[in-house]
Structures are given as C-alpha cells and as structure tokens.
C-alpha cells in the first residue's frame, strides 16, 4: 500500500465526553506504512 491503511480516530466517539473526530487514520498506522517508514531491527544472533 502506498498509503496502506488509515487509522486515525474513527471512533473515540464511544468515550463519554469525547467529541467525534470522524477521521480514518488507519493508513498512517498500518503495517504497510510501518514498513515504509521504519527499519526492521536485525534479528538476534544466536
């Protein structure tokens, strides 16, 4: 995914007193995006 999934705050609306934001931010917090933005740590050596 170029913009994998966008997990934004689709729904903090279920929290009392918290306003609805209606934002889909799943792409920004997706596995695909993490692969684009971050280096995968080297696996531990035995």
């Amino acid at each position: 995914l170029a913009d994998p999934l966008d997990h934004r705050d689709a729904g903090d609306l279920w929290v009392p007193g918290e306003s609805e934001s209606f934002e889909d931010a799943h792409v920004e917090h997706s596995i695909s995006r993490s692969l684009l933005e971050g280096e995968i740590p080297f696996p531990p050596t035995s």
Epitope: D6, L13, S30, S32, S34, I40
Partner: antibody
C-alpha cells in the same frame, strides 16, 4: 516477510475463559494499530476490538457484543497482541483473526459448546 | 451503527468479462481530510481476507489494476475489469470511520 500468527484457540464450555495470542514479525510493530476480527460459522465478518499505539496511550475500543467480556492488549517488546475472552457464549464460536487491516493472520478457531 | 449492504449477494461471471459489486452505507463515510473510509476485502476459499482497496479508490499493494473502487459518500462500487480464475471468493466492503467498525454481508463471486 510480514507474519501474524494466532494461537490459543480451542473448544471451551460456555462461561469459561480463553486467551488468544497474535505473534507478529517482519515489521516495526510499535506504531501499528491492531484489531481482532472474527468470522462466524455463517461467514459474516465482525470487528470486535481495536488497540492503538503507545503514542495514543494504547486506547482500546470494542464491539458491543464483547464489551465487558473481552479485553484486547499488546506487548510491544514481544510484538504481540492478545485477546482475553471471559464469560464465553455459544455465539462467540468463530474463527478469530488478528489484523492490521492490510495484513491478516491465518485465523484461529474458537468453539464454545457444552 | 453504520450498516453496509451489498448487492448482489452472489454473482456468476465468465472469465474475461467484467464484474461490479455494489456497497451502500446508511451513513456518510466521508470523514475529515476529505477521506472516504470505505475498504474492499477479498476472501478466497479457505483463506484469510486480503485487502484490495482502501479509502474507496486506492489500490492496496500487490493488487492487480484490474480492480478499481469508486463511489460517493454512501454508495460504492468495486469493479473487476477482466475477471480471472484467481478472483473467485467472497468480496466484503467495510468501514473504519465510526465505531463499531462494520463489514458488509459479502458478495460471492464464482465463474460460469
């Protein structure tokens, strides 16, 4: 290679508890939002729980059908998420998937029956 | 809750022909930043769901460009321009804008 592997499924009696584990690898885990989605024997997909990242204070969200009975959690050091399922009911019988929405695990079967 | 309905629930297509699947929401899926939170997944027989389209019209990584998504705030369409054997399975639309997140009932695509 991205991998999500669910374990912990089994046959349990109504009212009992079960804990599912989703072990992930192949990607930087800490900033990824994760979900549990289940699929009933009738093949309907149902989102049941969501956990955000540390930067979002590990906020959690649940479907009404599981709220108060199921708890989603994560351990960034183990790059894993969990689903603690209490007071299980017959209609919790399903295949449970761990997903980041763009990648999915293979699923694990949970059967609740007396 | 946000209810998604799909039509048809089953479709039979000749390989090489096009196919369209409709998804309708009872609420607008247009969120802030002008992002429409409608996703399409394909579940092939015996497999886990896989992401095809995100945010209504964006093709997921590795998905052939035979697939395309379009729509408005409440009415959406997945089109497969030339159906291939590997496209057989159940197609689900889903929304990730409002909790609880919801999936459509699925559309089963089979070959004639």
């Amino acid at each position: 290679e991205v991998q999500l592997v669910e374990t912990g499924g089994s046959l349990v009696q109504p009212g009992k508890s079960l804990k599912l584990t989703c072990a992930t690898s192949g990607f930087p885990f800490s900033n990824v939002w994760m979900h549990w989605v289940r699929q009933s024997p009738e093949k309907q997909l149902e989102w049941i729980a969501h956990i955000k990242a540390k930067s979002d204070n590990y906020a959690t969200y649940y479907a009404e059908s599981v709220k108060g009975r199921f708890t989603i959690s994560r351990d960034d050091s183990k790059t894993s998420i969990y689903l603690q399922m209490n007071s299980l009911k017959d209609d919790d019988t399903a295949i449970y998937y761990c997903t980041g929405l763009d990648y999915w695990g293979q699923g694990v079967m949970v059967t609740v029956s007396s | 809750d946000t209810v998604l309905t799909q039509a048809p629930l089953s479709v039979s297509v000749t390989p090489g022909e096009s196919a369209s699947i409709s998804c309708r929401s009872n609420k607008s899926l247009l969120g802030i930043r002008d992002i429409t939170s409608l996703y399409w997944f394909l579940q092939k027989p015996g497999k886990s769901p896989q992401l095809l389209i995100y945010r209504m019209s964006n093709l997921a990584s590795g998905v052939p460009d035979r697939f395309s998504g379009s729509g408005s705030e409440t009415d959406f369409t997945l089109k497969i321009s030339e159906v291939e054997t590997e496209d057989v399975g159940v197609y689900y639309c889903a929304q990730f804008l409002r909790y609880p997140y919801t999936f459509g009932p699925g559309t089963k695509l089979e070959l004639q």
